[in-house]
Interface confidence: medium
């Protein structure tokens, strides 16, 4: 499993992971106490046939070509959690691990 | 976590799981001994904002709206393996569990 890493200066048009820092304060998400900012990353780019396909399934659907199947898109294929301090629904402040907050790898699926 | 299930008669335009039977013989994939056909399913449909978003990350990227982020697309969010009998690259016949061959759920990511 591998994926491309890019930055704002990259000329890569294919599916790639780009850096993105999310700022909760800028969003007005005041129920999140910490971190106020974190490195989330995101996926962007084109998915030419077979490039960075995570699953054999993606290839099979392309072969079968059913009605309405749009072809693969550039999406997170590996994500990781972060620890956060936040208000839960009961107005308690909780320290907890929130899954799938960081994109570690992008691919076509 | 939930996802929509549709069939060929559905009028649903949103991201949905559709039935798809993959036929390896029809593809000419003769290195797969068994199964010759299996129910793979696929994802198709529109991802309006917040609908069926698997990860909070998807929402955050939408909020941050970085250059080139294309918005979420309808993609498998839960997959399962199948057991297969197949020739490997060394002409050995192997019985093994192949991951991510069946789409169990679709969502927007």
């Amino acid at each position: 499993d591998f994926g491309l890493d890019c930055d704002e200066h990259s000329t890569e048009s294919r599916c790639c992971r780009y850096p993105l820092t999310v700022d909760f304060e800028a969003f007005g998400w005041d129920w999140i106490i910490a971190p106020k900012r974190y490195k989330a990353n995101y996926c962007s780019g084109e998915c030419e046939f077979v490039f960075l396909q995570k699953y054999p399934h993606t290839h099979l659907v392309h072969q079968a070509n059913p009605r309405g199947s749009a072809g693969p898109c550039c999406t997170p294929t590996k994500m990781s959690p972060i620890n956060m301090l936040y208000f839960n629904g009961k107005e308690q402040i909780i320290y907890g691990k929130i899954p799938a907050m960081v994109v570690d790898r992008c691919g076509c699926s | 976590d939930f996802g929509l299930d549709c069939d060929e008669h559905s009028t649903e335009s949103r991201c949905c799981r559709y039935p798809l039977t993959v036929d390896f013989e029809a593809f000419g994939w003769d290195w797969i001994i068994a199964p010759k056909r299996y129910k793979a399913n696929y994802c198709s449909g529109e991802c309006e904002f917040v609908f069926l978003q698997k990860y909070p990350h998807t929402h955050l990227v939408h909020q941050a709206n970085p250059r080139g982020s294309a918005g979420p697309c309808c993609t498998p969010t839960k997959m399962s393996p199948i057991n297969m009998l197949y020739f490997n690259g060394k002409e050995q016949i192997i019985y093994g569990k192949i991951p991510a061959m069946v789409v169990d759920r679709c969502g927007c990511s």
Partner: antibody, heavy 125, light 107 residues
Framework: QVQLVQSGPGLVKPSETLSLTCTVS??????????WGWIRQPPGKGLEWIGT???????YYNPSLKSRVTISVDTSKNQFSLKLSSVTAADTAVYYC?????????????????WGQGTTVTVSS | DIQLTQSPSSLSASVGDRVTITCRAS??????LGWYQQKPGKAPKRLIY???SLQSGVPSRFSGSGSGTEFSLTLSSLQPEDFATYFC?????????FGQGTKLEIK
Amino acid sequence: QVQLVQSGPGLVKPSETLSLTCTVSGGSISNSNYYWGWIRQPPGKGLEWIGTTYYSGTTYYNPSLKSRVTISVDTSKNQFSLKLSSVTAADTAVYYCARDYYDSSGYYYNWFDPWGQGTTVTVSS
Amino acid sequence: DIQLTQSPSSLSASVGDRVTITCRASQDIRNDLGWYQQKPGKAPKRLIYAASSLQSGVPSRFSGSGSGTEFSLTLSSLQPEDFATYFCLQHHIYPWTFGQGTKLEIK
């Protein structure tokens, strides 16, 4: 590295307001990974978290003290302060300031490190 | 609030001894617990974070274990500089709360 130096009176009269300041050196109080807190320790007793602030002014207080506590930040002076109103003898304690560190990767957090040197505050007339 | 109960409240031991201090939480706090050492007239110093991770620069004779509601701090071979008071801290639910402390004295 970051160091915290406390200042403020050691004696406060009952019903008055206790005021302490913590000056940060070796780092910016406006660092988005840093949070700034106060803890106290009555004589011969355990530690009690009072509250925590972020440089933007967002504050979180211990409910047991919330009605009497104000924590504020002065980014221009690189310091933050504690005010505790309507004090009684039960507020006699050693007061500490401390930093919390939250890494922006979300993987590593560090509570109460480093600490200030501590200020002994006696409430007495 | 989550209560942390430390035991024993005081302990006498000799240099070279192995000692264990326990901390019991009033509800499940996963592994969101730290251990601190405090010497007279000084600010506390963190020894252990996330229940079992050793703070950088802390000697390996200190170790932490546990999760949920039962935690312990073990000193494998006491050194003269280890005689101090030890506190546990939970950082799972605000307000953060500390144990009442265990005073480790020289026998």
